[in-house]
């Protein structure tokens, strides 16, 4: 039986029963987050032979081997991968061996086996027999091989049963467990699979077969499966499906994905039955099963039944996710919300065209319209009374429309109307007239010069910084004293600052009027002495971190009918000084001879600067008598030393202890300092590890269903 579209077994080990009748999992298999150690011996799924996507195991307590669960798992196709991997075994606390003794082929993708503190029998598997390329495999932080004492079947009795291959210049026996060899086919079979009796399978078989040279006896197919036969390509009038089988048009026409709407089923494109048209193609009509190329970027047309879509919350904006053309009118009415600017950008940021009008009213939560970051055309096919196609009324905190230096917006038909936007400067509106091509369409009352910008410092002067001083967690800055025409109009200054790894921030980033603001704000009172330059000490900052800072003068906004001048600075980027790093992580030590200790650690999580060297101190301690109570020649009596759970394999260091020739004399001495390239590689490695772990957590931790 084919199971799918992906099976996620979590929290309760009894959910494994879902796999009972599966021969092929069309999709992925997740087994994860089972925190209570269980007895898995009664669970066995001999029918399962193929997983078409990937297998992921994560934090399953009590599971010691996969061999009993999946004794006949032969192929993992890797049609879709988990972060480039077809097999992921991560933080499996009790796993002692992989044990998938019938696994013969991972068609696409690599493997990642990491942070499994008890996992052995890794160096005894020759992954090159299973995967095409082993260079992308990532096997790190498992039980060190020296503590495993991996022995393949028969070696203790000096009657080895397994075959040997060479890995890293080491010719050795290959096995999955203490009693299961790794299967290898005779060299006469070449790339072909073979039966248990070493007879070569049909070339279209993959992994194994029940009878030689028979394309109906394959355990899995190299290419495609159709009507009980493995075929090199799908026959006429059938289509590739999920990367492994052939289906007919009726089948493809009749299935829906978990996410799709009723009408939008699968499509047939380039001989394949797929969920959606591929990138650069679009359905040839809403009910069509066929794809045609897009002209330019593919549009997603969204239509509102009631003609006007009201955006009054994040939920209503969510309906527009991915839309590039909106057929209808947009009425934006955002009075409140949490993190509203970035949420709106997430859901409405792709809209390029609105066919009707855009009306923004009572949106007190908005500071800017930059969340409509791709809007380039308002057609105005439908207009508000008075022939308005862009209408902005009573938005108490709206300060910016768009960044007109980086924005082309055309309003094809209709006029603009602006009223009661007290923080929106008229100059900003006039700029929009020029950019959108609406200049001359508006009549006198359409842009109200009295009640737009009445509470804003509109004509801005530039404040100049005069000095900056930094320490590890402080920045002191001063700036020129600003002198408006009437000194009494200057109330105070506000300093805005935030972490800015890159010099690309803008004043309105992530800002809305409901308190969501990526900038920290500090008010600075006027110095009592008119000749003293204003300044501030920003403290509690992170060492060796770049910050963006700018300052605004807070001024009285109206002197009778005149808008008074305000002032603000450019954005200044400034880095704090370096400081003492946090402690190194994951310190490990192991002896690789009678006179040497290898010590290994990870860099501190907060380097607080550029690390230049480490200091290592050690002292002698009394010998532990416990070590003498064991027979080290007996395989099963190796004492378990508790290692830091799932960190980094000591083997990485001990394989090639460096000895250098120093000062003309031969003899061992300190290893050469790491080259920049080595340091960079290690940094990238650490970063990659972090990125993968984040990806894993983000992928598998989901809200509990209602």
């Amino acid at each position: 039986e084919i199971c799918g579209p992906g099976i996620d077994i979590r929290n309760d080990y009894q959910q494994l029963k879902r796999l009972e009748n599966c021969t092929v999992i069309e999709g992925y298999l997740h087994i994860l987050l089972i925190s209570k150690a269980e007895d898995y011996r009664s669970y066995r799924f001999p029918k399962l032979t193929v997983i078409t996507e990937y297998l992921l195991l994560f934090r399953v307590a009590g599971l010691e081997s996969l061999g009993d669960l999946f004794p006949n798992l032969t192929v993992i196709r890797g049609w879709k991968l988990f972060y480039n991997y077809a097999l992921v075994i991560f933080e499996m606390t009790n796993l002692k061996d992989i044990g998938l003794y019938n696994l013969r082929n991972i068609t696409r993708g690599a493997i990642r086996i990491e942070k499994n503190a008890d996992l052995c029998y890794l160096s005894t598997v020759d992954w090159s027999l299973i995967l095409d390329a082993v260079s992308n495999n990532y096997i790190v932080g498992n039980k060190p091989p020296k503590e495993c004492g991996d022995l393949c079947p028969g070696t203790m009795e000096e009657k080895p049963m397994c075959e040997k291959t060479t890995i890293n210049n080491e010719y050795n026996y290959r096995c999955w467990t203490t009693n299961r060899c790794q299967k290898m086919c005779p060299s006469t079979c070449g790339k072909r699979a073979c039966t248990e009796n070493n007879e070569c399978c049909h070339p279209e078989c993959l992994g194994s077969c029940s009878a030689p040279d028979n394309d109906t006896a394959c355990v899995a197919c190299r290419h495609y499966y159709y009507a009980g036969v493995c075929v090199p390509a799908c026959p006429p009038n059938t289509y590739r499906f999920e990367g492994w089988r052939c289906v007919d048009r009726d089948f493809c026409a009749n299935i829906l994905s978990a996410e799709s709407s009723d009408s939008e089923g699968f499509v047939i494109h380039d001989g394949e039955c797929m969920q959606e048209c591929p990138s650069g193609f679009i359905r040839n009509g809403s009910q069509s099963m066929y794809c045609i190329p897009c002209e330019g970027p593919c549009p997603k047309v969204c239509e509102e039944e009631k003609k006007t879509k009201t955006i009054d919350s994040v939920t209503s904006a969510q309906m527009l996710q991915g839309c590039t053309i909106f057929k209808g009118n947009l009425l934006i009415n955002i009075r409140r919300g949490n993190n509203i600017a970035s949420e709106l950008e997430n859901f409405m940021g792709l809209i390029e065209v609105v066919t009707g009008y855009v009306k923004i009213r009572h949106s007190h939560a908005l500071v800017s319209l930059s969340f409509l970051k791709n809007l380039r055309l308002i057609l105005g096919e439908e207009q508000l009374e008075g022939n308005y196609s862009f209408y902005v009324l009573d938005n108490q905190n709206l300060q910016q429309l768009w960044d007109w230096d980086h924005r082309n917006l055309t309003i094809k038909a209709g006029k603009m109307y602006f009223a009661f936007n007290p923080k929106l400067c008229v100059s900003e509106i006039y700029r929009m007239e020029e950019v959108t091509g609406t200049k001359g369409r508006q009549s006198k009352g359409d842009i109200n010069t009295r009640n737009n910008g009445e509470r804003a410092s509109c004509e801005s002067d530039v404040l100049h910084f005069t000095s900056t001083t930094t320490s590890k967690n402080r920045i002191i800055i001063t700036w020129h004293r600003y002198r408006p025409p009437d000194y009494r109009d200057l109330i105070s200054f506000t300093v805005y600052y935030k972490e800015a790894p890159f010099k690309n921030v803008t004043e309105y980033d992530g800002q809305d009027a409901c308190g969501s603001n990526s900038w920290n704000m500090v008010d600075v009172d006027l110095p009592p002495n008119k000749d003293v330059e204003p300044g501030i000490l920003l403290h509690g900052l992170k060492p060796w971190t770049q910050y963006a800072v700018y300052v605004k003068a807070v001024t009285l906004t109206m002197v009778e009918n005149d808008h008074i001048r305000g002032a603000k600075s450019e954005i200044l980027y400034i880095r704090t000084n370096a400081s003492v790093p946090s402690i190194p992580l994951d310190v490990l030590s192991a002896s690789n001879s009678s006179s040497q200790l290898i010590v290994k650690w990870n860099p501190p999580s907060l380097p607080n600067g550029n690390l230049s060297y480490y200091i290592v101190r050690w002292q002698r301690q009394p010998q532990d008598g416990y070590l003498y109570r064991h027979n080290y020649c007996s395989k099963d009596k190796i004492p378990i030393r508790k290692y830091a759970d799932g960190t980094i394999d000591i083997e990485e260091v001990t394989e090639n202890p460096k000895t250098e020739v120093c000062g003309g004399e031969k003899g061992p001495c300190c290893a050469c300092p790491k080259t920049e390239a080595e340091k960079q590689a290690e940094k990238e490695e650490a970063e990659y590890r972090k990125v993968f772990e984040n990806f894993l957590h983000n992928s598998i931790f989901v809200p509990r269903p209602e």
């Epitope: 039986e1 009748n21 007919d248 089948f251 009749n254 299935i255 994905s257 978990a258 009723d262």
Partner: antibody, heavy 123, light 112 residues
């Protein structure tokens, strides 16, 4: 083209059994469930159950559970429906109809029907 | 079991005129994932049934656009905008959301 060809009409005595066959062609037999629907003379349609040809898994209407057995032979792409302990009210046309076999969501149920097999139960 | 009740049971119509058939389920046939498997089948005299509408409102391929379906929850309707002579037969609604799947008792459409 896609076809479901059913066996010929049957006349049975009360208490006997009948086995109706439905031979599929023009599509992959194992990609679809086979359903059985009956229609008594002048009456409406009644779903009896279905079978998954891949593993023989069945889903019966409780009304027929004790008397019906559905089977398939994948080598000949044929489905069978056996009804035991026949009564006179089992006189009906018995239809086979296919329905997509997919773990996900399907759009519709019975897109292809057989012509029907008339089973008459009479003493 | 879910009972599907159709009305009217008989529907005489003049060609070119519209027709409407109602189908009511004894309980909601919306599945937990939001899918509603409500279908309409037409059985022409002496033939096997044929699919017209699936999932409440979607026309099956080859079905003329004069046929349309609507409804939600427990109330559903099949409409024929302009009846033609070839539309005669018995129309059945069918729910495929809950086992056992059930048909309505049928509505016989005939030409006046």
């Amino acid at each position: 083209q896609v076809q479901l060809v059913q066996s010929g009409a049957e006349v049975k005595k009360p208490g006997a059994s009948v086995k109706v066959s439905c031979k599929a062609s023009g599509y992959t037999f194992t990609d679809y469930y086979m359903n059985w629907v009956r229609q008594a003379p002048g009456q409406g349609l009644e779903w009896m159950g279905n079978i998954n040809p891949n593993n023989g898994g069945t889903n019966y209407n409780q009304k027929f559970k004790d008397r019906v057995t559905m089977t398939t032979d994948t080598s000949t792409s044929t489905a069978y429906m056996e009804l035991r302990s026949l009564r006179s009210d089992d006189t009906a046309v018995y239809y086979c109809a296919r329905w997509i076999l997919y773990y996900g969501r399907s759009k519709w149920y019975f897109d292809v029907w057989g012509r029907g097999t008339l089973v008459t139960v009479s003493s | 079991d879910i009972v599907m009740t159709q009305s009217p049971l008989s529907l005489p119509v003049t060609p070119g005129e519209p027709a409407s058939i109602s189908c009511r389920s004894s309980q909601s046939i919306v599945q937990s994932n939001g899918d509603t498997y409500l279908e309409w089948y037409l059985q022409k005299p002496g033939q096997s049934p044929q699919l017209l509408i699936y999932r409440v409102s979607n026309r099956f391929s080859g079905v003329p656009d004069r046929f349309s379906g609507s409804g939600s929850g427990t109330d559903f309707t099949l409409k024929i905008s302009r009846v033609e002579a070839e539309d005669v037969g018995v129309y059945y609604c069918f729910q495929g959301s809950h086992v056992p799947y059930t048909f309505g008792q049928g509505t016989k459409l005939e030409i006046k």
